[in-house]
Amino acid sequence: TQHGIRLPLRSGLGGAPLGLRLPRETDEEPEEPGRRGSFVEMVDNLRGKSGQGYYVEMTVGSPPQTLNILVDTGSSNFAVGAAPHPFLHRYYQRQLSSTYRDLRKGVYVPYTQGKWEGELGTDLVSIPHGPNVTVRANIAAITESDKFFINGSNWEGILGLAYAEIARPDDSLEPFFDSLVKQTHVPNLFSLQLCGAGFPLNQSEVLASVGGSMIIGGIDHSLYTGSLWYTPIRREWYYEVIIVRVEINGQDLKMDCKEYNYDKSIVDSGTTNLRLPKKVFEAAVKSIKAASSTEKFPDGFWLGEQLVCWQAGTTPWNIFPVISLYLMGEVTNQSFRITILPQQYLRPVEDVATSQDDCYKFAISQSSTGTVMGAVIMEGFYVVFDRARKRIGFAVSACHVHDEFRTAAVEGPFVTLDMEDCGYNIPQTDESTLMT
């Protein structure tokens, strides 16, 4: 995933004190034995900090070395810091692991901004607050990097949860989740509940706080309300989906739906913002500006450069529109919509200079690589990555931040014709995923 532009993301306190929890609704989905129910040991296993990533604790090697690892559904390598770096408190020391095996192969991963490079090997890996299993997985031991690790982020590596097609150096390097499923009885599915705080967190609050849950191998009922709605995974590389319609406060953007997916649309936990293709971004901003025109915001706000602030507790959420993305459904000519609030797309930012106010950054930005449904989207929902059935599920998150007037929503079905035409076919080249 594009690490320079797609800064890993933001988290918060589980249940977010400023966010009201919705009452449970009846789950109309049929039970799927072994894949649903309670996963108490995995709930609240993510932590993080605004704009810097949600991470899970993992252990690598024998004896186990504990590291915090960024959860990234937008890449496919398990890569960890393996040499001293000014931004790392700790790193993987291969020489201390009796189970480390060198693959005698290097890996180099450039991004639009920055890069990391390292040496490939395998070792025993487990997730303390995950399934009670240990797997031998491929590990890229990062020996050199530029603009990859983030000062103060508290994570030392990245867990790429996407498919082998985008693994580096090539698709023969089996991703961690594939290894996990092959070597254990863990079902081929994971789900993420990312909980935005609704307010900025300082370092000590972050270290003591909960940022959400990664449920490996199943779905936890307690983490969502209402029903799960599924959209097909269009192609198993990134978690690619198809957006068929976009509305701002119920007003259709009225664009050719191909534009929404140009050149792809992906679900990426490693990106902070909702990123939109240039034309779509411009149309969306124009519509959001019009809807919120009772206040005049600086141009720099829409660019993500300037913060906007209000006296503490007086943020006029009601002047900002809701944003709905309609996703292709599982049934022919059927779609469903996911709706986010300004509480998701206005990111709270702490600034000492304006500490008496509540300040926010606009967390929708322009993309040259398609739509990226990052934390801004995911923090509203419980997201199920059902790899076994090649689909992604969305339900309203039990921890999403909202107010007494509006909540995030997942609703359907809607009749939508010719949805297949909304997908963009990327011209295939050997380098098609390089520098994304």
Partner: antibody
Framework: QVQLVQSGAEVKKPGASVKVSCKAS????????IHWVRQAPGQGLEWMGM????????KYNQKFKARATLTVDTSTSTVYMELSSLRSEDTAVYYC?????????WGQGTLVTVSS | DIQMTQSPSSLSASVGDRVTITCKAS??????VAWYQQKPGKSPKSLIY???HRYSGVPSRFSGSGSGTDFTLTISSLQPEDFATYFC?????????FGQGTKVEIK
Amino acid sequence: QVQLVQSGAEVKKPGASVKVSCKASGYTFTNYWIHWVRQAPGQGLEWMGMIDPSDSYTKYNQKFKARATLTVDTSTSTVYMELSSLRSEDTAVYYCARSGVAFPYWGQGTLVTVSS
Amino acid sequence: DIQMTQSPSSLSASVGDRVTITCKASQDVGRNVAWYQQKPGKSPKSLIYSASHRYSGVPSRFSGSGSGTDFTLTISSLQPEDFATYFCQQYNSYPYTFGQGTKVEIK
């Protein structure tokens, strides 16, 4: 606390280039844009441009677009401003400033003197 | 570009005086105006943002008002450390522009 520390004074000949640095600390570097503003002796303030440290996206004042280049090194939390084809009227104090609402934080300034 | 015209360009006042500086934008900038104080040989210090909000740590004697095109900075009771040059800035649209400054001198 937030600090922006700039490099020292420079004396340059007309036609030369100068590169001024601004090292940031006390906040998450990639969360805020850095701006450059200059002030000629006894004059007002003039905005030159800005850079987003998270992705190196830049935006310039048209007046400086041809001669100014802003770059970033996130590994050292440092932003650079290079001004080329210097002329005597470029003699000024160059400030970096951090965004937020307007410019809450400023560097101490770097005096660039252009003289033959 | 948006022009920011400050007046007066200089003024003389005594400690304890109430001082008012105005700034006029050439077009509507909403409330996206900031004020800065600068002393000789020093960098600007942020005083006011969003036309009327004081930055943290700024004394309450400094206040700002206005919206649209007309803005005012008021120092309710001038203190010895307030003798300096004051600049307004619009950050509504690019390029960001500043007023030419108002020098507040001791009478």
